[in-house]
Structures are given as structure tokens and as C-alpha cells.
């Protein structure tokens, strides 16, 4: 038949485009928390607000006990901003007395935990020095990148010092992820 030459040799099946509104996503905001005991070489994980104010979880993306739970495999954009605050008087005390309990730097880590893998994986890390800034200092650290995640992966945000985290406004400290 004329025109048969133009027919494809195999049928290509196109998956219907998925609406963005159906994709798993979450935006979590800062919540007050009391500093807890943690192992010396491990940064404590932050708790998050998941339903009040600007915070939400949608389309099977769930938050439980510090962890954002990934409901399906795919490429996700993961982000967090943590705003720290303190006073430089703490820094001068560090220099004078060598006090180990007040840091001269602040660190944020976004960590992935996979049940099948024994060790948590650091996905993103940001560190800033704080001792050269003004008398009452504020320092935001923003992290964000795309990662391939598997269903069941868990994400958390660890910080070097919970007591320095600014919890006063939900737009200062936040954590989120969405399927691309």
C-alpha cells in the first residue's frame, strides 16, 4: 500500500502528561523545639511544622518525626533554609576561654536515610563562619539541588546547634521537596 512506507515499524506509546498538582510535594516551616541530647559527632535533626501557617504536605508526601517521607521514585528538588542568630559576645568568649559549647561556625546538612543502607547520606551541606559579623548576628544558610530519590527514602535537616536556630518566623527557616 502506498503510504505504508511512512507507517512506523513499532507503535510508540506516550504516557499521558501528569499534572503538576498531582505530584508529591511539601513545604515545612520552623517550629519551636527544645535542644536534645545527641551524639558528639552527630548534628541534631530539626523538627518541622507540617500543617499550620505556610506549611503543607500533599499527594502522599508525608512528614513524621523529623523526616520527610518520599512516596515514589523520581527526581526531586530538595531545599532548605535555616536562619541562625546569636551574639558576638559568645564569640569573644570562645576566643578568650576556648569554650567548646558555643560554635564559631554554623552548619546545615540535608541528609537522606534509606532503610536498605546502614549509613545516612549527606546530600547537601552549608557552613558559614559567624564570629566576624556584627554584635547581634543573623545568618541564613540556603541549600537546594535536584536528586534522584527512591520510594521510602527519608529526608531530614541537621544543624550544628539547635539553640541558634531562629524560630521566630516561618519564612526564615524552612524545608521542602517536590517531584519534578
Amino acid at each position: 500500500l502506498k503510504g505504508q512506507e511512512f507507517a512506523p515499524s513499532h507503535q510508540q506509546v506516550y504516557a499521558p502528561l501528569r499534572a503538576d498538582g498531582d505530584k508529591p510535594r511539601a513545604h515545612l516551616t520552623v517550629v519551636r523545639q527544645t535542644p536534645t541530647q545527641h551524639f558528639k559527632n552527630q548534628f541534631p535533626a530539626l523538627h518541622w511544622e507540617h500543617e499550620l501557617g505556610l506549611a503543607f504536605t500533599k499527594n502522599r508526601m508525608n512528614y513524621t518525626n523529623k523526616f520527610l517521607l518520599i512516596p515514589e521514585s523520581g527526581d526531586y528538588f530538595i531545599y532548605s533554609q535555616v536562619t541562625f542568630r546569636g551574639m558576638t559576645s559568645e564569640c569573644s568568649e570562645i576566643r578568650q576561654a576556648g569554650r567548646p559549647n558555643k560554635p564559631d561556625s554554623i552548619t546545615v546538612v540535608i541528609t537522606k536515610v534509606t532503610d536498605s543502607y546502614p549509613e545516612p547520606t549527606q546530600l547537601l551541606m552549608g557552613t558559614k563562619s559567624v564570629c566576624e559579623v556584627g554584635s547581634n548576628w543573623f545568618q541564613p544558610i540556603y541549600l537546594g539541588a535536584m536528586f534522584s530519590l527512591q520510594e521510602g527514602d527519608k529526608l531530614m535537616v541537621n544543624v550544628s546547634d539547635i539553640s541558634l536556630v531562629d524560630y521566630t518566623k516561618e519564612d526564615k527557616t524552612f524545608f521542602g521537596a517536590f517531584l519534578l
Epitope: 517550629v31 519551636r32 523545639q33 527544645t34 536534645t36 523538627h47 500543617e51 501557617g53 505556610l54
Partner: antibody
Framework: QVQLVQSGAEVKKPGASVKVSCKVS????????VHWVRQAPGQGLEWMGV???????DYNSKFQGRVTMTRDTSTNTVYMELSSLRSEDTAVYYC??????????????????WGQGTLVTVSS | DIQMTQSPSSVSASVGDRVTITCRAS??????LAWYQQKPGKSPKLLIY???SLQDGVPSRFSGSGSGTDYTLTISSLQPEDFATYFC?????????FGQGTKLEIK
């Protein structure tokens, strides 16, 4: 900034009802929980109930059947109505926005933001 | 319901004094305790949450401690503006009971 502004003082007769309003700004009543707490003259604070962000309510069993909490999302206002008033209901009534906080892995509620209070006097 | 018992009901002290107020819960509230300050004719003000964490903007002379059923609020060096009534409140479960209050008066 967060503000809760309550309606003015009321004088009511026993058996009547009173409806106190709490107009909020700086947040939405659909995204935060608003509680009601009362304080009789010279007495302590007594939790009455909550209008949850999702529009459901919980009431202190002491007031169950007499208290009704509602809201108007168009004006960002929460209302507390108390019926069958008696002299013991004479008190200052406060609305308050609840805050969540964590200790270890458990969360708890407290009240970082309060309205200015509304004095309700029940007298024959 | 959880019952909250504060003591003393009133205390007289002078500027510069150290004052301690206690609050006992009828069951373990796992450090889910807040402290408030209230001045006459004013709304309560949150001072401490989680038994020991200072709310933003509250002076460091205020501190809280305790666990289980027993909690304390301490003012290390009383200032004139600290004379007020103090309440504890459990945040674990409804009806989120308050203590009956401790009135701090000038000696």
C-alpha cells in the same frame, strides 16, 4: 504582625447568651488554631475550647452543650458563643493563637499570642 | 483531665531576690509545660515552653526546669517589672489545664 482584637465588654442577664468576636490579622484562621480561655475575677485561667484550622472544634467538657465556636473566613474572625449564662460565667474571655513546640519527639501546645480580653458580666 | 497545682499561691520578695515557683502535674506531662506572666488588666505573656526553653524576647533572668510531674520557674534577680501573677500550663492534652497562679508581690 500577629494581632487578635476582641469585641467590647458585655453585660448580660442570667439565662441569656453572649457572643464574643476575635478578629485576627497577620495570619489566617484557616491556617492556625484559635483557642478560647477565660478568667473569672481574681481567679486562674480556664481553657474553654478551640477552633482548629480545619474548622472542626473541641470543647472543654465543662462547657459542652453551652459553648459554640464558629468562624467567618471572609473577615478572618472567630466567634465564641456561651449560652444559659449564670453569675459564675462573669469573667474576662480571651482568644489566643496556639503554637506547637517539640520536646524530643512529642509535640505540645501553648499560647504565644493573645487577644486583649473581653469582660462579660452576668448580673440580674 | 490533668490537674496542675502551683505553689505557693503568693510570695513576697524584694528587687534583686531569687524567687522560685513550682508546678506539679497530676500525671507525667513529659516536659510539655509552659509558664506565663500576667499583669493586672493585661493578657498573659508566654515566658517559657517545653519546661526550660525561653520564649523569644524574654529576659534571661527567667529560667525553667523540671521533668515528669514536677516543674519550677526561677527568676534569678527580681526586677520591678517582674511583680505579677505567674501561671503554668500543660500542653500535652486537652483541656490544656493551667495552674491556679502564683502572685508575686513586693515585700
Amino acid at each position: 504582625q500577629v494581632q487578635l482584637v476582641q469585641s467590647g465588654a458585655e453585660v448580660k442577664k442570667p439565662g441569656a447568651s453572649v457572643k464574643v468576636s476575635c478578629k485576627v490579622s497577620g495570619f489566617s484562621v484557616t491556617r492556625y488554631n484559635v483557642h478560647w480561655v477565660r478568667q473569672a475575677p481574681g481567679q486562674g485561667l480556664e481553657w474553654m475550647g478551640v477552633m482548629w484550622s480545619g474548622a472542626n472544634t473541641d470543647y472543654n467538657s465543662k462547657f459542652q452543650g453551652r459553648v459554640t465556636m464558629t468562624r467567618d473566613t471572609s473577615t478572618n474572625t472567630v466567634y465564641m458563643e456561651l449560652s444559659s449564662l449564670r453569675s459564675e460565667d462573669t469573667a474576662v474571655y480571651y482568644c489566643a493563637r496556639a503554637g506547637r513546640y517539640y520536646v524530643d519527639s512529642n509535640y505540645y501546645w501553648d499560647f504565644p499570642y493573645w487577644g486583649q480580653g473581653t469582660l462579660v458580666t452576668v448580673s440580674s | 483531665d490533668i490537674q496542675m497545682t502551683q505553689s505557693p499561691s503568693s510570695v513576697s520578695a524584694s528587687v534583686g531576690d531569687r524567687v522560685t515557683i513550682t508546678c506539679r502535674a497530676s500525671e507525667d506531662i513529659y516536659s510539655g509545660l509552659a509558664w506565663y506572666q500576667q499583669k493586672p488588666g493585661k493578657s498573659p505573656k508566654l515566658l517559657i515552653y517545653g519546661a526550660s526553653s525561653l520564649q523569644d524576647g524574654v529576659p534571661s533572668r527567667f529560667s525553667g526546669s523540671g521533668s515528669g510531674t514536677d516543674y519550677t520557674l526561677t527568676i534569678s534577680s527580681l526586677q520591678p517589672e517582674d511583680f505579677a501573677t505567674y501561671f503554668c500550663q500543660e500542653g500535652l492534652k486537652s483541656p490544656y489545664t493551667f495552674g491556679q497562679g502564683t502572685k508575686l508581690e513586693i515585700k
